[in-house]
Amino acid sequence: MEDFNMESDSFEDFWKGEDLSNYSYSSTLPPFLLDAAPCEPESLEINK
């Protein structure tokens, strides 16, 4: 485990999968687990 490394201001979710993750690396996502207000659109609820 290491501290967050700000090499870029744009991030993609690791686990959501190519068809569900933000493939364009939108910079609206905050660094992982930091105290930032999430700015993502309403999440897709997959399960019925």
Epitope: E12, D13, L33, P38
Partner: antibody, heavy 120, light 116 residues
Framework: QVQLVQSGAEVKKPGSSVKVSCKAS????????ISWVRQAPGQGPEWMGW????????NYAQKFQGRVTMTRDTSISTAYMELSRLRPDDTAVYYC?????????????WGQGTLVTVSS | QAVLTQPSSLSASPGASVSLTCTLR?????????IYWYQQKPGSPPQFLLR?????????GSGVPSRFSGSRDASANAGILLISGLRSEDEADYYC?????????FGGGTQLTVLG
């Protein structure tokens, strides 16, 4: 320094349920999905599903539909995975994991694992 | 037939280069997928090494040395993890994974033994 810290080992009877917790230590739950992955003794990893900590939205693997429930409590930075109607073949180490990628690098975070033993 | 097939075991000497393969089931084109590679040592969770789809779409795990690299073999419909300059600490189980049909699918794993 961010860590995912899981609850301790459990021994359960067939037919019962288990609830495993995963706490973000050194940070708060963000909008990145938290996946749950299990690994039976001597077997490869098996993905169970993920939860979006921000919205609570879930995506469960078909195999576990109807038997697994993933929730989160953002006030205490903790995600939960509950598996019901346990069978002996549910005996495994259960991991939570999360992470994100930039254009050139990925950062993954895993809990230490929780051993769940199902035995009569 | 499994979605992802890996050889169960492989052994090589220190300093050698080894290629670990992850063959996708017929009808699933390797060129359409990011192939994820993990290393796992006894008693520890899997550790992400890298993911590879093409030379323009590849990401290394944080802190993972460059001697771990990815490629693909289109003719064999397989993803490849290349480990160069093999070290004793590389002895571990290696798993590939893909996001397929809205689920993460893992291969059965390859147990890599470093001789000597």
């Amino acid at each position: 320094q961010v860590q995912l810290v899981q609850s301790g080992a459990e021994v359960k009877k067939p037919g019962s349920s288990v609830k495993v917790s995963c706490k973000a230590s050194g940070g708060t739950l963000s909008s990145y999905a938290i996946s749950w992955v299990r690994q039976a003794p001597g077997q490869g990893p098996e993905w169970m599903g993920w939860i979006n900590p921000n919205s609570g939205g879930t995506n469960y693997a078909q195999k576990f539909q109807g038997r697994v429930t993933m929730t989160r409590d953002t006030s205490i930075s903790t995600a939960y995975m509950e598996l019901s109607r346990l069978r002996p073949d549910d005996t495994a180490v259960y991991y939570c994991a999360s992470g994100y990628c930039s254009r050139t690098r990925c950062y993954d975070y895993w809990g230490q694992g929780t051993l769940v033993t199902v035995s009569s | 037939q499994a979605v992802l097939t890996q050889p169960s075991s492989l052994s090589a000497s220190p300093g050698a280069s080894v290629s670990l393969t992850c063959t996708l089931r017929s009808g699933i084109n390797v060129g359409a997928y990011r192939i994820y590679w993990y290393q796992q040592k006894p008693g520890s969770p899997p550790q992400f090494l890298l993911r590879y789809k093409s030379d323009s779409d590849k990401q290394q795990g944080s802190g993972v040395p460059s001697r771990f690299s990815g490629s693909r073999d289109a003719s064999a419909n397989a993803g490849i993890l290349l480990i160069s300059g093999l070290r004793s600490e590389d002895e571990a189980d290696y798993y590939c994974a893909i996001w397929h049909s809205s689920a993460w699918v893992f291969g059965g794993g390859t147990q890599l033994t470093v001789l000597g």
